[in-house]
């Protein structure tokens, strides 16, 4: 018995070949012997039953001369899953058609971090098929009648080519995923005290009609609890602020991409924030973490100090050096100082290996006098 796979709504071609490779009389029937269609010697396709009943069934007249008499079933339905019989040259060929339906839960448009379940349904009691989906960038996910893709990323968006294999027979179908998310899961901004701070939250997708609301919660390093800094609404590309804290006095861009400006970096603002965006008609929220590290260099009496506040990695090195000279002091700590610094331009550096994250300069005029 030959097996043919078909996806609901698409077409399937059931094969029937003559041994003599020439036109001959043939008939396609259901397993209960009801006639579907055939050719009785005049080269004319004869349909069984009423036209409306069999309008989805056809054959390839162009292939008859070569001894091929396929049964084409269009707009496949789940109930088409059954055995079909081709009668020709005093023999019967049985062809088993397995029609499957693909469902995507919760859908093919998802938020970053969500999971997708792809399910194959069928009327027939077939043994477990192999389902495999491959992204154009090479990622492969496989399963049987159920295929799961968890913790989806923005880069999982786009076209996936899927194959269903059963008894070495294959059927292809495609799915286009749209995973909505921010371009970066997290970002870190390094600023000297007093500098203006800009936070950007670009989305990694473009949707013409985008409706939702968002909020930025901030956990300052110096504070015991987090605080809502700003809430906003989003409609298409239009951003409107609903509520903003008085300290700091944030400003938000009125159109996408989401963008916030903090007038100046101060030690009390150093810390980390979480921007959440809830989109209409989507369960769950999008998140982006943002971190602010603030540096201050000061000279008080005979002490030159450099401090950083905010979430720094243990690998980061803080150094104080006189310009064009070796570092006077370097530590994996958040504060370094030099007693009785000599006159000149001093540099405070925050670095990760040989990569300088930020630097602040302070002019020491003479012992105990400074100018930043």
């Amino acid at each position: 018995k030959t097996l043919v796979l078909g996806k609901e709504g698409e077409s399937a071609e059931l094969p029937c070949e003559s041994s003599q490779k020439k036109i001959t009389v043939f008939t396609w029937k259901f397993s209960d012997q009801r006639k579907i269609l055939g050719q009785h010697g005049k080269g004319v396709l004869i349909r069984g039953g009423s036209p409306s009943q069999f309008d989805r069934f056809d054959s390839k007249k162009g292939a008859w001369e070569k001894g091929s008499f396929p049964l084409i079933i269009n707009k496949l339905k789940m109930e088409d899953s059954q055995t079909y019989i081709c009668e020709l040259e005093n023999r019967k060929e049985e062809v088993e058609l397995w029609v499957f339906k693909v469902t995507f839960s919760p859908g093919t448009s998802l938020l970053q971090g969500q999971s997708l379940t792809l399910t194959l349904d069928s009327n027939s009691k077939v043994s477990n098929p192999l389902t495999e989906c491959k992204h154009k960038k090479g990622k492969v996910v496989s399963g049987s009648k159920v295929l799961s893709m968890s913790n989806l990323r923005v880069q999982d968006s786009d076209f996936w080519n899927c194959t269903v294999t059963l008894d070495q027979k294959k059927n292809w179908f495609g799915m286009t995923l749209s995973v909505l998310g921010f371009q970066k899961a997290s970002s870190i901004v390094y600023k000297k005290e007093g500098e203006q701070v800009e936070f950007s939250f670009p989305l990694a997708f473009t949707v013409e009609k985008l409706t939702g609301s968002g909020e930025l919660w901030w956990q300052a390093e110096r504070a015991s609890s987090s605080k809502s800094w700003i809430t906003f609404d989003l409609k298409n590309k239009e951003v409107s602020v609903k509520r903003v804290t008085q300290d700091p006095k944030l400003q938000m861009g009125k159109k996408l991409p989401l963008h916030l400006t903090l007038p100046q970096a101060l030690p009390q603002y150093a810390g980390s924030g979480n921007l959440t965006l809830a989109l209409e008609a989507k369960t769950g929220k999008l998140h982006q973490e943002v971190n602010l590290v603030v540096m201050r260099a000061t000279q008080l009496q005979k002490n030159l100090t450099c401090e950083v506040w905010g979430p720094t990695s243990p690998k980061l090195m803080l150094s104080l050096k006189l310009e064009n000279k070796e570092a006077k002091v370097s530590k994996r700590e958040k504060a370094v100082w030099v007693l009785n610094p000599e006159a000149g331009m001093w540099q405070c550096l925050l670095s990760d290996g040989d990569k300088v994250k930020m630097d602040s300069r302070i002019q020491v005029l003479s012992r105990g006098v400074n100018q930043t």
Epitope: Q196, D233, K235, E238, S240, G253, K254, H259, T261
Partner: antibody, heavy 118, light 107 residues
Framework: EVQLLESGGGLVQPGGSLRLSCSAS????????MSWVRQAPGKGLDWVSS????????YHADSVKGRFTISRDNSKNTLYLQMSSLRDEDTAVYYC???????????WGKGTTVTVSS | AIQMTQSPSSLSASVGDRVTITCRAS??????LGWYQQKPGKAPKFLIS???SLQSGVPSRFSGSGYGTDFTLTISSLQPEDFATYYC?????????FGQGTKVEIK
């Protein structure tokens, strides 16, 4: 063709009120942000107020807050500016402007003149 | 509110000259900046959006650049019809604010 036509300007005494209208045609009025911008004689452009078509949110310059109210009637394709407690410094040509899809004022009316004087 | 400082306030130039007008924002506004041209007794005309994107129908001798706080409008070869007043507008946030204008006059 997109067209904006302002009306309602005139002479008014300090402390008085006036309502400006802007009739729009040639585009789907309800989809766009609409604004009022003014220009005092011999001076530069001064943004007054904006209203979103999508959300209905309104925004006003500090100098007119509490005195001027922007509104719109999408069924009539008309933008309004209700001005009260008028001052000498409100004397200007008032332009109606339409935002484009990127939220820039791309099309402007010819303006209507408001004179506040006793 | 964000302040927009335009310079120079006026300039005299001849036909064929290259003219540059600058606009500085009191805080970062990304590239959310527009440029407008206004002739006496007329409504402003929209020239450039997003700091550098020329509007359709605007001659290619006009160009814009900048990001953050510093922006420039350049007219590569001044034509007689370009004598007018030019305004920058920050469109980053409300309240929208214009520069005070630059009047380009015939030398």
């Amino acid at each position: 063709e997109v067209q904006l036509l302002e009306s309602g300007g005139g002479l008014v005494q300090p402390g008085g009120s006036l309502r400006l209208s802007c009739s729009a045609s040639g585009f789907t009025f309800s989809d766009y942000v609409m604004s009022w911008v003014r220009q005092a004689p011999g001076k530069g452009l001064d943004w007054v107020s904006s209203i979103s078509g999508l959300t209905g949110n309104t925004y006003h310059a500090d100098s007119v807050k509490g005195r001027f109210t922007i509104s719109r009637d999408n069924s009539k394709n008309t933008l309004y500016l209700q001005m009260s407690s008028l001052r000498d410094e409100d004397t200007a040509v008032y332009y109606c402007a339409k935002d484009n899809e990127d939220y820039y004022m791309d099309v402007w009316g010819k303006g209507t003149t408001v004179t506040v004087s006793s | 509110a964000i302040q927009m400082t335009q310079s120079p306030s006026s300039l005299s130039a001849s036909v064929g000259d290259r003219v540059t007008i600058t606009c500085r924002a009191s805080q970062g506004i990304r590239n959310d900046l527009g440029w407008y041209q206004q002739k006496p007794g007329k409504a402003p005309k929209f020239l450039i959006s997003a700091a550098s994107s020329l509007q359709s129908g605007v001659p290619s001798r006009f160009s814009g650049s900048g990001y953050g706080t510093d922006f420039t409008l350049t007219i590569s070869s001044l034509q007689p019809e370009d004598f007018a007043t030019y305004y920058c507008l920050q469109d980053y946030t409300y309240p929208r604010t214009f520069g005070q204008g630059t009047k380009v006059e015939i030398k």
